[in-house]
């Protein structure tokens, strides 16, 4: 079981009883980690591992964990209040405009171009012309020296549904 | 092209009401979750609450929750938010927003979501 699991994240059916807690909704919503019954009346926990709610709600099932595809790692599992998080494998990355699959990144920069940046889970390798030190998409880096690529935005949960 | 238009913000006492509503271009509406978030002068964007593509059941910030209710029409492509029982930090321009493709089914951080509209401002004073 991983380290990042503690006793908050565990739905009460992990503590204790095995039967799903039931609660009552507060001003008509469920806190995270629950949904609402149908007649509105109880809240239940979602079961860990298998659902979830990150915000209150009143959604009728919790939301189902993402399963990691191939080619992703697992960051971090899928609790009763948080989805699993995924990231592209080492060699691979999730563009923003595209995130629904992890691509190759490129192996080495066009003819005129060095690299100036690495490939992360999040990113491509970055190239800039050597001459002018413009960047392949035609920005023009602040310093002219080398540029270091930054460690980027946090890991995002993955975005194929199992 | 997305094109996403708020309406509906203005200025209320604090207490009031106001329905913020956002008409969507795209014929992917129906089948999309969306969401409303906030941007008060000097702070971030924050999410307020997001609602399934079917309409049935939804996500609320703690900060609003029982204040404000979220709904969609999907024949009309219409997303609303009931605003009630207004503070002073509600005060903030409001933006409705349609998730990237593939993103979770119901997507609640500003990075989940590409297409926005333009906001509409809300200001809550006395």
């Known amino acids: 079981e991983s380290a990042l699991i503690t006793q908050q994240d565990l739905a009460p059916q992990q503590r204790a009883a095995p039967q799903q807690k039931r609660s009552s909704p507060s001003e008509g919503l469920c806190p995270p980690g629950h949904h609402i019954s149908e007649d509105g009346r109880d809240c239940i926990s979602c079961k860990y591992g298998q659902d979830y709610s990150t915000h209150w709600n009143d959604l009728l099932f919790c939301l189902r964990c993402t399963r990691c595809d191939s080619g992703e790692v697992e960051l971090s599992p899928c609790t009763t209040t948080r989805n699993t998080v995924c990231q592209c494998e080492e060699g691979t990355f999730r563009e923003e405009d595209s995130p629904e699959m992890c691509r190759k990144c490129r192996t080495g920069c066009p003819r005129g171009m060095v690299k100036v940046g690495d490939c992360t889970p999040w990113s491509d390798i970055e190239c800039v012309h050597k001459e002018s030190g413009t960047k392949h998409s035609g920005e023009v880096p602040a310093v002219e020296e080398t540029v270091t690529s930054s460690p980027g935005t946090p890991a995002s949960p993955c975005s194929l549904s199992g | 092209e997305v094109q996403l238009l708020e309406s509906g913000g203005g200025e209320v006492q604090p207490g009031g009401s106001l329905r913020l509503s956002c008409a969507a271009s795209v014929s992917t509406f129906g089948t999309s979750p969306v969401g409303w978030f906030r941007q008060a002068p000097g702070k971030e964007r924050e999410f307020v609450s997001a609602?399934?593509?079917?309409?049935?059941?939804?996500y609320y910030a703690e900060s609003v929750k029982g204040r404000f209710t979220i709904s969609k029409d999907n024949a009309k492509r219409t997303l609303y938010l009931q605003m009630s029982s207004l503070r002073a930090e509600d005060t903030a321009v409001y933006y409705c927003?349609?998730?990237?493709?593939?993103?979770?089914?119901?997507?609640?951080?500003?990075?989940?979501?590409?297409?926005w509209g333009q906001g509409t401002l809300v200001t809550v004073k006395p």
């Open positions: 609602i399934r593509w079917d309409g049935v059941g939804a």
């Open positions: 927003a349609l998730p990237r493709r593939g993103e979770s089914e119901l997507p609640s951080t500003v990075k989940e979501y590409g297409y």
